[in-house]
């Protein structure tokens, strides 16, 4: 009932709670002397469904048959309307439409840990839209029966608050859940289990790792478990990996030796537990332990390359370069590199430790046979030294690779191809492809890059430290014993027309011709490899087409003679530069008048 209903009553038949699809009869009746004054026929009873009129009748009572009510609660209110007055509320009623509970499905019970409590979950099925009470019953041996009720609207979980204990691990227990509401009841299928079936151990805790004698090969993982645990699974992986290594162990008693860990690697370790070989479930994974394995002495050998530069008649500069060992080869933090330089005939040697660099430059006499050895050292030892005999890498002309070409291959890649040298190609032991940014001054501080290629390869894709719109000097070396031959080419991965032309800085007259000198275009404005320079000239104040002279680009060249100018004529001159993508804008303009005599 909605209020005190002093003036009348609303009755609902068969019930205030009905099955979806049922019909209800709603009767609104006035109590004696509660109608309109004077004429009872003037009583107009109106039935509202929520705030919508659905029926009315003149007299002391109103009957209405209602169908098609939706799931949930519907409010009906009866009001009285008299002439010349507002409607008066008589009484009301709520009707609850729902369904009987479906059979609860997938009843499952679990006890978390040996000292945890038994808790069960189930699937309720579709919503009944009515108050539904769930009763969970657990039966054990010797007529033991516990029952617990749940009165939440959406009840699908109950914890008994009691524990099964390991003293009778084979005793059977049966759980069953029953749902009851005004329209019916339904029970789940029973779920029968033993202590071993439902106890899910707590995850292992207090995980530690020990490396005996600071060695990765003597590694033991320790942890603590609940007392009854029989099985463990261990999983571990390098912290930067997504794939786990898995190990299953029986009766580990809180320790296990790991034999396949890599040195100087951060690992993540987790452990899970189980009470029985084929009963019950695995615990959750433990919290992760993160630990770094100890260093081991480096394996592998450094990749070493070098450059020779003539200084004067008696001295040469040697620049050594080497690549970092991979993480798996370094097996620790590289503390320094040891470089040994030795004159092979005299036997005198010089050793130096290099830290923080992967290159070393020294000056040695041009005479004698020189060799170097380079190794990497960490806290546990050194790698095997890489030995190289210093030779003139380009001395053997017959070993020079032929038809070297360099072509752009996608973004920031250059494909270098060549043909084997004329001399017996089978003599080649390996090719080395070397590249560095082209700097007109031949700057030796520019980083050097290289890769090694097997003797049967005739191409290499270079991608390391390749930038767009930069020109690279590329050399291909063919090495055979203590001899080498080389060929070079310029190449870029991406190019466009230069952003500016050369700047003419001087024009001088020499025996009836002129010599034009210019400044190189700044590297960042070249936009790739320059192929040509063009010198343009035309008579001042003339509208004729300019004449031009095209000069193949050479790195060190920055002057060129022109001998086709007429004496005592003033000319305007300017220059441009070209890449394979096109020509730059004009450089500066200079005027010049040749003073020599006319023919």
């Amino acid at each position: 009932k909605i209020d005190a209903c002093k003036r009348g009553d609303v009755t609902v038949k068969p019930s205030h709670v009905i099955l979806l699809g049922s019909t209800v009869n709603i009767t609104c009746s006035l109590k004696p002397r509660q109608g309109c004054f004077h004429y009872s026929r003037r009583n107009k009873l109106i039935l509202y469904k929520f705030d919508r009129r659905i029926n009315f009748h003149h007299g002391h009572s109103l009957n209405s048959q209602v169908t098609g009510l939706p799931l949930g609660t519907t409010l009906f209110v009866c009001k009285l309307a008299c002439i010349n007055s507002d409607e008066i509320q008589i009484c009301g009623a709520e009707i609850f439409v729902g369904v009987a509970p479906e059979q609860p499905q997938n009843l499952s019970c679990i006890q978390k840990g040996e000292q945890g409590t038994v808790a069960c979950t189930w699937e309720r099925g579709r919503d009944t839209h009515l108050y539904t009470e769930y009763t969970l019953q657990l039966s054990g041996p010797k007529n033991l029966t516990w029952q617990k009720q749940c009165k939440d609207i959406y009840c699908d979980y109950l914890d008994f608050g009691i524990n099964l204990t390991p003293e009778s691990p084979e005793s059977n227990f049966t759980a069953k859940v029953t749902a009851v509401n005004s329209l019916g009841s339904s029970s789940s299928l029973p779920s029968t289990f033993t202590f071993l079936d439902i106890v899910r151990p707590l995850p292992p805790w207090d995980i530690r790792i020990k490396f005996q004698k600071a060695s990765v090969s003597r590694c033991t993982l320790y942890w603590r478990d609940e007392g009854l645990v029989l099985l463990n699974r261990l999983r571990y992986r390098p912290s930067n990996s997504r794939l786990w290594n898995m190990v299953n162990v029986t009766k580990a008693k809180g320790r296990h030796d790991l034999l396949d860990l890599k040195p100087f690697t951060e690992y993540e370790f987790q452990i899970s537990s189980k009470l029985h070989l084929y009963k019950g479930s695995w615990s959750d994974w433990s919290e992760s332990l993160r630990a770094q394995t100890p260093e081991e002495e480096p394996t592998g050998m450094l990749d070493v390359w070098y450059m020779k530069r003539h200084i004067d008649y008696s001295r040469q500069q040697i620049s050594l370069f080497w690549k970092n060992l991979s993480v798996s080869e370094a097996r620790g933090k590289i503390l320094h590199y040891q470089v040994t330089l030795q004159e092979l005939t005299g036997g005198k040697a010089m050793t130096q430790n290099i830290t923080g660099h992967t290159s070393w430059t020294t000056v040695i006499p041009r005479t004698g046979n020189w060799a170097v050895a380079v190794s990497a050292a960490n806290s546990k030892g050194s790698s095997l030294p890489t030995r190289i005999n210093i030779m003139n890498l380009c001395e053997a002309g017959l070993l020079a690779p032929r038809q070297v070409s360099a072509n752009s291959e996608g973004m920031d890649n250059i494909l270098v191809t060549w043909q084997p040298p004329r001399k017996d190609p089978s003599a080649v032991q390996e090719y080395v492809v070397e590249w560095r940014e082209l700097h007109p001054g031949g700057d030796t501080q520019v980083p050097l890059n290289w890769l090694r290629s097997r003797p049967y390869n005739v191409s290499a894709l270079i991608s390391e430290n390749i930038k767009s719109y930069i020109c690279y000097e590329i050399r291909v070396y063919a090495l055979s014993g203590d001899q080498g031959g080389c060929s070079s080419i310029l190449g870029n991965s991406k190019h466009k027309a230069p952003l500016s032309g050369p700047h003419i800085n001087a024009i001088t007259e020499e025996k009836g011709s002129i010599l034009i000198s210019w400044n190189s275009i700044p590297v960042q404005e070249q936009m790739g490899c320059l192929l040509h320079y063009r010198i343009y000239w035309k008579e001042r104040d003339s509208n004729s087409q300019p004449q031009l002279c095209e000069i193949p680009y050479r790195v060190s060249q920055n002057s060129h003679p022109i001998n086709s100018l007429q004496p005592r004529v003033t000319y305007v001159l300017w220059m441009t530069a070209l890449t394979a993508a096109g020509e730059s804008s004009h450089g500066n303009e200079r005027e010049f008048c040749l003073q020599g005599k006319a023919n």
């Epitope: 008994f160 009691i162 524990n163 204990t165």
Partner: nanobody, 115 residues
Framework: QVQLQESGGGSVQPGGSLRLSCGAS????????MHWFRQAPGKGQEWAAT????????YYSDSVKGRFTISRDNAKNTLYLQMNSLKPEDTALYYC????????RGQGTQVTVSS
């Protein structure tokens, strides 16, 4: 070593009351649900009542419901059974247990109800 020691039994007239105690040691008492069982002469073991580890939930067999009250004091590691309105059929050896089958239990304390 799990140890349970019952006390408080005795003879009482029908309608009378008794309070049984069970002292526990050798395990973390506050982590376990506890149980009272009884065994009448010539009969099998019968479960009487259970209390959850925190004491928040209690369960009773139909034969004792409304007359017996199980409780616990985790600070004292002690379990109790308050028995009111005792009947002659309540005569039995009463013992407390840590496990639901009564496998780990004390020696028991005798309760005799007769006029």
């Amino acid at each position: 070593q799990v140890q349970l020691q019952e006390s408080g039994g005795g003879s009482v007239q029908p309608g009378g009351s008794l309070r049984l105690s069970c002292g526990a040691s050798g395990f973390t008492f506050s982590s376990f649900g506890m149980h009272w069982f009884r065994q009448a002469p010539g009969k099998g073991q019968e479960w009487a009542a259970t209390i959850s580890s925190s004491g928040g939930t209690t369960y009773y067999s139909d034969s004792v419901k409304g007359r017996f009250t199980i409780s616990r004091d985790n600070a004292k590691n002690t379990l109790y059974l308050q028995m009111n309105s005792l009947k002659p059929e309540d005569t039995a050896l009463y013992y407390c247990a840590r496990d639901v089958t009564g496998a780990v239990r004390g020696q028991g304390t005798q309760v005799t109800v007769s006029s």
